[in-house]
Amino acid sequence: EVEKTACPSGKKAREIDESLIFYKKWELEACVDAALLATQMDRVNAIPFTYEQLDVLKHKLDELYPQGYPESVIQHLGYLFLKMSPEDIRKWNVTSLETLKALLEVNKGHEMSPQVATLIDRFVKGRGQLDKDTLDTLTAFYPGYLCSLSPEELSSVPPSSIWAVRPQDLDTCDPRQLDVLYPKARLAFQNMNGSEYFVKIQSFLGGAPTEDLKALSQQNVSMDLATFMKLRTDAVLPLTVAEVQKLLGPHVEGLKAEERHRPVRDWILRQRQDDLDTLGLGLQGGIPNGYLVLDLSMQEALS
């Protein structure tokens, strides 16, 4: 808290300009009118104020707007945004994408801070859903943004927004998130032809069910091993050796290098050894000849 002291004669600020950097904290408090500051916020960013001076400016705005800053002020906060707490930001009503971009720019190159997370949360809740433009903006600043959302939050993403998603945006998504995103992607890309469709859907396949993988195996897609390794274990297990061979195409040889890893390891154990031998890769651990192959889906449902 800065003590209330009278402004010295001749020091009353008529403009927000560089002369203010020579003011002591108490002089800033006494001589800068909060309403003036609010109308000339765009100038603050160009002036090399100290952190202590910025604290005073923030204090003045807090007094002027105890219920939260108006968007006209928020849009021009610049580096003063870094002084805001999540509690401050929860009072705001940010509706303009331009405002959001301006504030994200301030934090660019840094991890997502609690302030930024709160700002994004307020913005998205205000809009009601993650529209394409918002998603475009957020993933441009934070490629991992999509994967930071809960499955429940992802359910509000409209299929049209999926066009904004790049493969790297999904790098840290877990299976539950991909379970939500995959059906949206499938819907978004449904009118594309085979090879183009596969290019777009590939990053989302960690949420694909068995029947979709079976369908893809009939389309000569040549899925790479990195994608195959990210598929849901329960979706891979029912695939036959022939289906996996068709799905992977020339990449099928890579199964040997992955035989100790999931989901390949689990899949191998479910196949007849005779069938595995047809691949000519030396994969071992399949069900020996003469063994009854159980209806595993039924077994697992029962157990």
Epitope: T233, L237, R260, L269, R270, I287, P288, Q299
Partner: antibody, heavy 120, light 107 residues
Framework: QVQLQESGPGLVKPSQTLSLTCTVS??????????WSWIRQPPGKGLEWIGY???????YYNPSLKSRVTISVDTSKNQFSLKLSSVTAADTAVYYC????????????WGQGTMVTVSS | DIQMTQSPSSLSASVGDRVTITCRAS??????LNWYQQKPGKAPKLLIY???SLQSGVPSRFSGSGSGTDFTLTISSLQPEDFATYYC?????????FGGGTKVEIK
């Protein structure tokens, strides 16, 4: 409710073979959705996976123990077994059998464990 | 083999505290990461599977997050029955491996 129960001698002499059996009750070991594992824990230390077996008889062993380990399954008795040869004092541990779900990759059911001491 | 490194190895906390335990894999394991709780003289008990899914019957104060190499177990409000040792375990690749454990003690 599936339950696992380890059985076998609590004392084994050095250089001999440790033999333990795990009996599965409340469900079939032939259910294809699970791997049947052995895990051990030396006194005051962490957990070490020994290996597992699938109902078909396929096995995976920890390479650090592979030369000494055999895991087998008897589906008719609903049991699977562990044999660890040429034991030393370093093999003294609580031995657990556990069920691993192929879907989740997690050990969702464990036996209560049996303490095996290697000493002459 | 994939090494699993847990930290801290032990911690002291009070009832009601928020507790976070981390687990790091020596290479990417996707989401094939499980968490267990073990009390003295008892077998481990599964808490979280597939990095973030809560095992049936486990209280909702336990949660897991992470993907790739870095994972976290969080207990939102520590209860008297939560004082135990916690282990992470990767199930991506054989040999299956566990973290060294984190002992949660009463402060």
């Amino acid at each position: 409710q599936v339950q696992l129960q380890e059985s076998g001698p609590g004392l084994v002499k050095p250089s001999q073979t440790l033999s333990l059996t795990c009996t599965v009750s409340g469900g079939s070991i032939s259910s294809g959705g699970y791997y049947w594992s052995w895990i051990r824990q030396p006194p005051g230390k962490g957990l070490e996976w020994i290996g597992y077996i699938y109902y078909s008889g396929s096995t995976y062993y920890n390479p650090s123990l592979k030369s000494r380990v055999t895991i087998s399954v008897d589906t008719s008795k609903n049991q699977f077994s562990l044999k660890l040869s040429s034991v030393t004092a370093a093999d003294t541990a609580v031995y657990y059998c556990a069920r691993e779900s192929t879907g989740t990759g997690a050990f969702d059911i464990w036996g209560q464990g049996t303490m095996v001491t290697v000493s002459s | 083999d994939i090494q699993m490194t847990q930290s801290p190895s032990s911690l002291s906390a009070s009832v009601g505290d928020r507790v976070t335990i981390t687990c790091r894999a020596s290479q990417s394991i996707s989401s094939y990461l499980n968490w267990y709780q073990q009390k003295p003289g008892k077998a481990p008990k599964l808490l979280i599977y597939a990095a973030s899914s809560l095992q049936s019957g486990v209280p909702s104060r336990f949660s897991g997050s992470g993907s790739g190499t870095d994972f976290t177990l969080t207990i939102s409000s520590l209860q008297p029955e939560d004082f135990a040792t916690y282990y992470c375990q990767q199930s991506y690749s054989t040999p299956l491996t566990f973290g060294g454990g984190t002992k949660v003690e009463i402060k």
